[in-house]
Interface confidence: low
């Protein structure tokens, strides 16, 4: 979280999140788990119009999708 994050310099990808995005416009979703490089889960969506945006991993429509991706990643390790 933000409090622990201030203690170390981290390498996150997302400067800010887009609050609203239509799920139908998402072409590809990348989920970066929290780890030494960044204290929080980050979600980068490649939209069908070519744009890349960061999404809020707490967004209700994303939560289940993200959990599935993280779970499948854990199984590979």
């Amino acid at each position: 979280g933000p409090v622990s994050a201030v203690l170390t310099e981290l390498r996150c990808t997302c400067l800010r999140v887009t609050l609203r995005v239509n799920p139908k416009t998402i072409g590809k979703l990348q989920v970066f788990p929290a780890g030494p490089q960044c204290s929080k889960v980050e979600v980068v969506a490649s939209l069908k119009n070519g744009k890349q945006v960061c999404l809020d991993p707490e967004a209700p429509f994303l939560k289940k999708v993200i959990q599935k991706i993280l779970d499948s990643g854990n199984k590979k390790n």
Epitope: A5, V6, L15, R16, V17, T18
Partner: antibody, heavy 119, light 107 residues
Framework: QVQLQQSGAELVRPGTSVTISCKAS????????IVWVKQRPGHGLEWIGD????????FYSENFKGKATLTADTSSSTAYMHLISLTSEDSAVYFC????????????WGQGSLVTVSA | DIKMTQSPSSMSASLGERVTITCQAS??????LSWYQQKPWKSPKTLIY???RLADGVPSRFSGSGSGQDYSLTISSLESDDTATYYC?????????FGAGTKLELK
């Protein structure tokens, strides 16, 4: 402590270009975003774009696409903003700023670089 | 783009007075709001981030509140050093956008 040292004032001719530098110290340059902000008297503060040298990401305001180019030299911990086709509308103070520890706000600011476009 | 409506545009207050500046976003920004203080010919200084959190080294007389679309910055007891222009910034959605500023002067 975190410091952002910007280049000095520039007086340039219309139609020419200018490059402003922002040298960072006191932290790991590639771990944070550098943001650029424009300020004109009576126009407040306006976000130009930002750059994350650690991942090679740049984002631009629609208003500055084709006007500003953001780059960085990680070996010298310096960010640059190149402005082209200058007009009087580009006369302003330009600030660089470093993001907060989780990238969502502007925690530390440079002292500003004044650009004056005049014939 | 999200529009930030800041008010008042200017105000004067007496030493020791409680001062409140407000910012209204054109849509819910979920507390992704920060406040900055700028003195003439100086760079902005971060006061508050995430609507309520005090930045390092900022006196406790400054505080932030709000949620959804409505946010405020309060100075509990005005000091002479607080005369400046104050800006809000929403950074929840790209592009980040600033309020037009509030110029605060001493009476």
């Amino acid at each position: 402590q975190v410091q952002l040292q910007q280049s000095g004032a520039e007086l340039v001719r219309p139609g020419t270009s200018v490059t402003i530098s922002c040298k960072a110290s006191g932290y790991t340059f590639t771990n944070y975003w550098i943001v650029w902000v424009k300020q004109r008297p009576g126009h407040g503060l306006e976000w130009i774009g930002d750059l994350y040298s650690g991942g090679g990401y740049t984002f631009y305001s629609e208003n500055f696409k084709g006007k500003a180019t953001l780059t960085a030299d990680t070996s010298s911990s310096t960010a640059y903003m190149h402005l082209i086709s200058l007009t009087s509308e580009d006369s302003a103070v330009y600030f660089c700023a470093r993001s907060g520890y989780d990238r969502t706000w502007f925690a530390h600011w440079g002292q500003g670089s004044l650009v004056t476009v005049s014939a | 783009d999200i529009k930030m409506t800041q008010s008042p545009s200017s105000m004067s207050a007496s030493l020791g007075e409680r001062v409140t500046i407000t910012c209204q976003a054109s849509q819910d920004i979920e507390s992704y709001l920060s406040w900055y203080q700028q003195k003439p010919w100086k760079s902005p200084k971060t006061l508050i981030y995430y609507a309520t959190r005090l930045a390092d080294g900022v006196p406790s007389r400054f505080s932030g509140s709000g949620s959804g679309q409505d946010y405020s910055l309060t100075i509990s007891s005005l000091e002479s050093d607080d005369t400046a222009t104050y800006y809000c910034l929403q950074h929840g959605e790209s592009p980040p956008t600033f309020g037009a500023g509030t110029k605060l002067e001493l009476k």
